[in-house]
């Protein structure tokens, strides 16, 4: 039970006090007791429960005709059963006894009131009235945890507007209200109670810029909502009528968890005694609700796809046809960004990452806009954000970004268990340098901080700076699987490619050509590739880089070798000793459920079939996956990217609720 105030009683004059239902009020009977009295007894009205404990020994008994010694070891507490109909309608009488004097009486007139701030602390999607209880002041994780949840109101329900809903202090309509969390103030008091008392709703100054609270006028249109707390206003005096009354508030978060904001927001209602005009107002009681701002959550390839995004650029019609067909097979919506909007920037994966936020009453997809800000920079904010589709961005919006700040360098694993530690929403993966140096590249600290602060998908730093472009999607992917952990990790593997080519040479296919059918491209014989010592050295280096990541992923995701599939792939070291795919990088694939859009490798044709395609199909088809090889050679591959780089996917949110995990 929540702690109430301390009431001091005195025989000189009656004491008047307020007792809030659900709180435990301490009664000081000793400090004003007559000098020659040695004990006391208590009588109460039926609506008051008094408990007396004497320590030592800590015997506790309900009051009756018993008398109790007047000494510091006595603790008297009281609670009230119901709200008062009128001021001071409940009475407590303390009788002081002494050996030589008649009993001396002290009177306490109590007014019982119900003041309670409620929110969905049980995370059921409904607000249940709660009396003042300690639990509301703490937010706990896990299936048995409690505490309310706020969404950042980062969508744009008004198509006419260019701003997010949380950027204004108006409620657009009932749709906008659904993005907010309901909080109810319940009061039950005597009719005249608020002539002598005031309620103030407030938030800490350190949190005021992270939240906005609207007060709803009951039974009226949502447009009647008005801001009572927010970035410019940390407190608000409430006009509350006496009697039984409920007041609804709608709460929206304005900021995601981040470095200097753990995501917790406490809203408090304080009851002030304003009965003595000549004295300052005194706090009589406080009730608080703690909210946690819902984190931004990424979705892995194992989640069902719902929408595919791709750019239309000069001469990529065939690529578009292939992606369209794949999206249709996977029953996905397809969104094509036209040339006039993408400004010749085809790298849809690099511009944004689509995740979601979730509260018990609402789930919202949210696009995370990367700071790379090239031709597609307007696309997330102008075309993706909208009604029930949120937006967030981090990092410098002008300059100061590296290639590692593009979101081809941001992936997430499927759910994993590492030892005793569960990651039911998977772990974020991003690429970094091995160590900082004058020319090393890393993801901008603001992005790293944001990702870590979400707490629910603890990030893993991989090593990707060895690549020219430097993105993790150039050497890894995940595909769904029916067995084991429910997925496989795919890793690009020069070793596997050399093994395949060696086998083909041993079988007499050394003259088979790589890049057959590619105009203006030097076709390479298997035997020439195998005998090129420089290329071997380059791939030996690449293999070491990928193996470093392999061990890191095994350790951080709790994987065994049998959870990994090696995809044959060769690389070449280009300027500044950075690696690029030698032929289209098959691991850079689009995963739409069981349908995979894989860059067509243009490998050696043996017995009428590309041996690279055949090998990949033999590895993936047993998992129930369907491989479609997409020609991206001229439009993507020679521009240092592939199918995954050129596409993006909105996926179904996890059925697992983030608040049920323990980070």
């Amino acid at each position: 039970m929540a702690q109430g105030t301390l009431i001091r009683v005195t025989p000189e004059q009656p004491t008047h006090a307020v007792c809030v239902l659900g709180t435990l009020t301490q009664l000081d009977v000793c400090s004003s007791a007559p000098e020659d009295c040695t004990s006391f007894s208590v009588n109460t009205s039926p609506g008051v429960v008094v408990d007396i404990a004497h320590s030592p020994p800590a015997k506790k008994k309900s009051t009756g005709s018993s008398t109790w010694p007047l000494d510091p070891g006595v603790e008297v507490t009281l609670t009230m059963k119901a709200a008062s109909g009128s001021t001071g309608d409940q009475k407590v009488q303390i009788s002081y006894h002494g050996p030589k004097t008649p009993p001396v009486k002290a009177l306490l007139y109590l007014t019982g009131v119900e003041i309670s701030l409620s929110a969905d602390i049980t995370r059921t999607g409904k607000v249940k009235p709660t009396r003042a209880v300690e639990d509301k002041r703490t937010w706990t994780w896990g299936p048995c945890g409690q505490g309310a949840i706020l969404l950042v109101n980062c969508d744009r329900d008004n198509p006419e507007s260019s701003a997010m809903d949380c950027e204004d202090d108006e409620v657009l309509d009932s749709k906008d209200l659904k993005d907010m969390s309901l909080m109810t103030l319940s009061t039950k008091t005597p009719q005249d109670f608020f002539t002598r008392h005031t309620l103030v709703l407030h938030v800490a100054r350190s949190e005021m810029d992270k939240v906005r609270v609207f007060q709803a006028t009951r039974g009226r249109l949502s447009s009647r909502c008005r801001v009572v707390l927010g970035p410019k206003q940390p407190s608000h005096y409430l006009m509350v009528p006496g009697g039984k009354h409920n007041m609804d508030f709608y709460v929206e978060a304005l900021a995601f968890p981040d470095t200097n904001f753990p995501g917790l927001i406490t809203l408090t209602v304080s009851m002030l005694d304003t009965s003595k005009l000549e004295l300052p107002e005194a706090v009589v009681f406080q009730d608080s609700v703690v909210f946690r701002v819902a984190p931004w959550i990424m979705t892995p390839n194992t989640q069902p796809p719902q929408e595919v995004y791709v750019c239309s650029i000069f001469e990529n019609e065939d690529f578009l046809k292939s992606v369209t067909a794949l999206a249709m097979q996977a029953r996905c919506k397809l969104t094509i960004c036209p040339e006039e909007e993408n400004m010749d920037d085809q790298w849809m994966q690099d511009e944004m990452e689509i995740g979601y936020i979730q509260a018990p009453h609402k789930t919202l997809p949210v696009v995370f806009d990367s700071p790379r800000n090239r031709g597609l920079k307007e696309f997330p904010i102008k075309r993706v954000m909208g009604p029930d589709f949120g937006y967030v961005t981090r990092g410098p919006q002008t300059g100061g970004v590296s290639g590692l700040d593009s979101f081809g360098n941001l992936e997430v694993s499927p759910p994993v268990t590492v030892g005793d530690k569960e990651y039911p929403l998977g772990r974020i993966l991003f690429g970094d340098s091995c160590y900082p140096s004058s020319d090393s590249r890393e993801m901008h600290q603001a992005l790293q901080d944001f990702l870590s602060a979400q707490q629910v998908q603890a990030p893993v730093k991989l090593y990707s700076d060895w690549l020219t472009v430097g993105h993790v999607d150039e050497f890894l992917s995940f595909v769904p699987a029916p067995d084991r952990k429910g997925f496989r990790l795919l890793l690009a593997s020069p070793r596997s490619c050399y093994k395949l080519f060696q086998e083909q040479q041993n079988e007499g296919h050394g003259d088979a050509l790589l890049f057959q059918g590619i105009k203006k491209k030097n076709q390479q014989k298997i035997k020439n590739i195998l005998s090129n010592t420089t290329l071997r050295e380059h791939n030996s280096f690449v293999e070491r880089c990928i193996d470093w990541n392999r061990e890191l992923l095994k350790r951080e995701l709790g994987l065994a070798e049998s959870d990994i599939i090696d995809i044959p792939q060769l690389f070449k070291l280009k300027e500044f000793s950075k690696a690029e795919a030698f032929f289209p990088n098959m691991v850079n694939m689009l995963v739409l459920g069981k349908h995979l859009g894989i860059p067509k490798p243009f490998g050696p044709i043996i017995n009428g079939r590309c041996c690279l395609e055949e090998k990949v199909c033999s590895l993936l088809e047993p998992l129930g996956l369907h491989c479609t090889f997409i020609n991206d050679f001229y439009t993507y591959h020679i521009r240092h990217g592939e199918v995954h780089c050129g596409t993006n996917v909105r996926r179904k949110p996890f059925s697992f609720k983030w608040w049920n995990m323990v980070p």
Partner: antibody, heavy 128, light 111 residues
Framework: QVQLVESGGGLVKPGGSLRLSCAAS????????VSWIRQAPGKGLEWVSF????????YYADSVRGRFTISRDNAKNTVYLQMNSLRAEDTAVYYC?????????????????????WGRGTLVTVSS | QSALTQPRSVSGSPGQSVTISCTGT?????????VSWYQQHPGKAPKLIIY???ERPSGVPDRFSGSKSGNTASLTISGLQAEDEADYYC???????????FGGGTKLTVL
């Protein structure tokens, strides 16, 4: 063959900033590596910065790292050199140069390390 | 102080051959075959005449040839002509934190 024209040079005080532009014509810049090279009056050539215009991979000389930023706008077929915190020793003619990125090479051809097309240069003078 | 060392000047008569040396270290000229040579006439932009140690861009006369031995690269101009009078710079990829180094330049005078 691509042609390059530099602009944006001029007189600037120490600590000041300038942005040089290198506009390409005759070919699309996204197929090229572009470098900036400078030459102080009466002195030799000094390599300053590099960008792979296809994927914005960048590199800098020790003498300018942290002060200069190379970038590109493929839609405008232009590469930029943003020069901040300029010093007297940055006074030079700044040349923009390029090399075609030949994707056909089986292994690194080193095209990012040499410059087969040069602009005429633009003079930057840093003086109080 | 340039990272690659070239003689300040060389000279030769028309029709003769001259060789300009460019000495680096095991971390640049000695390690990589990414050595190039540039010709610069006064008031003009440099022009690439040799790349990847010995390769000539199209349009460059075969009188210009390049070679490398250990940490030293060389440019040889045979059958000297008056228009060859210019400054010549060598350049190499380097494993240092400045990845492209130039020599201090050599002034070629055709007597």
């Amino acid at each position: 063959q691509v042609q390059l024209v530099e602009s944006g040079g001029g007189l600037v005080k120490p600590g000041g900033s300038l942005r040089l532009s290198c506009a390409a014509s005759g070919s699309t810049l996204s197929d090229y590596f572009v470098s900036w090279i400078r030459q102080a009056p009466g002195k030799g050539l000094e390599w300053v910065s590099f960008i792979n215009t296809a994927n914005t991979f960048t590199y800098y000389a020790d003498s300018v790292r942290g002060r200069f930023t190379i970038s590109r706008d493929n839609a405008k077929n232009t590469v930029y050199l943003q020069m901040n915190s300029l010093r007297a020793e940055d006074t030079a003619v700044y040349y923009c140069s390029s090399a075609n990125d030949d994707v056909d090479d089986i292994v690194a051809p080193g095209r990012g390390y040499y410059m087969d097309v040069w602009g005429r240069g633009t003079l930057v003078t840093v003086s109080s | 102080q340039s990272a690659l060392t070239q003689p300040r000047s060389v000279s030769g008569s028309p029709g003769q051959s001259v060789t300009i040396s460019c000495t680096g270290t095991r971390g640049d000229v000695g390690r990589y075959n990414h050595v190039s040579w540039y010709q610069q006439h006064p008031g003009k932009a440099p022009k690439l005449i040799i790349y990847n140690v010995y390769e000539r861009p199209s349009g460059v006369p075969d009188r210009f040839s390049g070679s490398k031995s250990g940490n030293t690269a060389s440019l040889t101009i045979s059958g000297l002509q008056a228009e060859d009078e210019a400054d010549y710079y060598c350049s190499s990829h380097s494993r240092s934190s400045t990845p492209v180094l130039f020599g201090g330049g050599t002034k070629l005078t055709v007597l």
